[in-house]
């Protein structure tokens, strides 16, 4: 079937990091620098992704895989495939229009990036408050009142952290 | 708040320069490159180049090769973009933007009018 | 140098109208298409990053998506501030390049 396949197309037996050119008898030329294919057969090469100011290079382009891209220090990626860098905040903090903000009383941040969430409501759950919310913490809910009776374990685990949600800016 | 404020409009003679200013604040001037792109009347968007306000390095469009210097003053989070040898169809409004990967804030414009 | 082709070039539409523009690169850019909205005499705005990302402030009437060569832009119900041009734009290698426009006027 191969031989079959590269007698109707000379281009299927192209490997990745060439790419079958036209304008020399089909012949597999290898992709020019700062390009790539991934797959073999391939008519063109692909530009590759440029990591420059805010980004930084986590993988170098090579002729058969692209470059990837990270944001540099004090950054964070937002975004498919880090299509975008945000600034990054301290925990107890979340970035508004106007720079980096301290959560309001009753919301937190334990990361430096994304925005302030609620403490967890306890009594929702039935439950007490353990330890208290900071501005980087949550609270850590404990077994309600009526819990305490003798012989009772005195901590609950608090509920798995949440992902937390961020702002796309 | 992130701002980006430009010089004011300018009019200038064919075979002049221009030299349109872009203060940056808000931000760390130097985390983030600064991209001019230009809008003639009535027209779409065109990239010019950008500026590493980081280290200075710059990549102008093919078009404005010869024609155009970015360049910055880190003292005073300032870019600068110059256009020499101006014809008329130069005549356009100049932005600069913040490049966070995609172009996150803009200045106001600068409207270059290009006439003898 | 990456070319965006974006259509329609212009359209008419009513309040609360579902729009949908769309942008064709002539090479993979993986996800690195951004769209921005401009009202004259004003400058560019940021709408959508890496393709279907909004950005803080944003209605999220306003949604992105596609990924390689083909992507879209999409209003949901058509406000009246809605009525603008439109541009795509890639940010995955310089020389950065826009799509030229689409023009959204009311019926």
């Known amino acids: 079937f191969e031989r079959t396949r590269s007698l109707q197309d000379p281009c299927s037996n192209c490997p990745a990091g060439t790419f079958c050119d036209n304008n020399r008898n089909q012949i597999c030329s290898p992709c020019p620098p700062n390009s790539f294919s991934s797959a073999g057969g391939q008519r063109t090469c692909d530009i590759c992704r440029q990591c420059k100011g805010v980004f930084r290079t986590r993988k170098e382009c090579s002729s058969t895989s692209n470059a990837e891209c990270d944001c540099t220090p004090g950054f964070h990626c937002l975004g498919a495939g880090c299509s975008m860098c945000e600034q990054d905040c301290k925990q107890g903090q979340e970035l508004t229009k106007k720079g980096c903000k301290d959560c309001c009383f009753g919301t937190f941040n334990d990361q430096k990036r994304g925005i302030c969430r609620p403490w967890t409501n306890c009594s929702l759950d039935g439950k007490s408050v353990l330890v208290n919310g900071t501005k980087e913490r949550d609270v850590v809910c404990g077994p309600s009142p009526a819990d305490l009776s003798p012989g009772a374990s005195s901590v609950t685990p608090p509920a798995p952290a949440r992902e937390p949600g961020h702002s796309p800016q | 708040q992130v701002q980006l404020v430009q010089s004011g409009a300018e009019v200038k003679k064919p075979g002049a320069s221009v030299k349109v200013s872009c203060k940056a604040s808000?931000?760390?001037?130097?985390?983030?490159?600064i991209n001019w792109v230009r809008q003639a009347p009535g027209q779409g968007l065109e990239w010019m180049g950008w500026?590493?306000?980081?280290?200075?390095?710059?990549n102008y469009a093919q078009t404005f090769q010869g024609r155009v210097s970015m360049t910055t003053d880190t003292s005073t989070s300032t870019a600068y973009m110059e256009l020499r040898s101006l014809r008329s169809d130069d005549t356009a409004v100049y932005y600069c933007a913040r490049d966070a990967g995609p172009l996150d804030y803009w200045g106001q414009g600068t409207l270059v009018t290009v006439s003898s | 140098e990456i070319v965006l082709t974006q259509s329609p070039s212009s359209l008419s539409a009513s309040v609360g109208d579902r729009v949908t523009i769309t942008c064709r690169a002539s090479q993979s850019i993986s996800s690195y298409l951004n769209w921005y909205q401009q009202k004259p005499g004003k400058a560019p705005n940021l709408l959508i990053y890496?393709?279907?990302s909004l950005q803080s402030g944003v209605p999220s009437r306003f949604s992105g998506s596609g990924s390689g060569t083909d992507f879209t832009l999409t209003i949901s119900s058509l406000q009246p501030e809605d009525f603008a041009t439109y541009y795509c734009q890639q940010s995955y290698t310089t020389p950065y390049t826009f799509g030229q426009g689409t023009k959204v006027d009311i019926k």
């Open positions: 890496g393709a279907s």
């Open positions: 808000g931000y760390t001037f130097t985390s983030y490159d």
């Open positions: 500026i590493g306000t980081y280290n200075g390095v710059t």
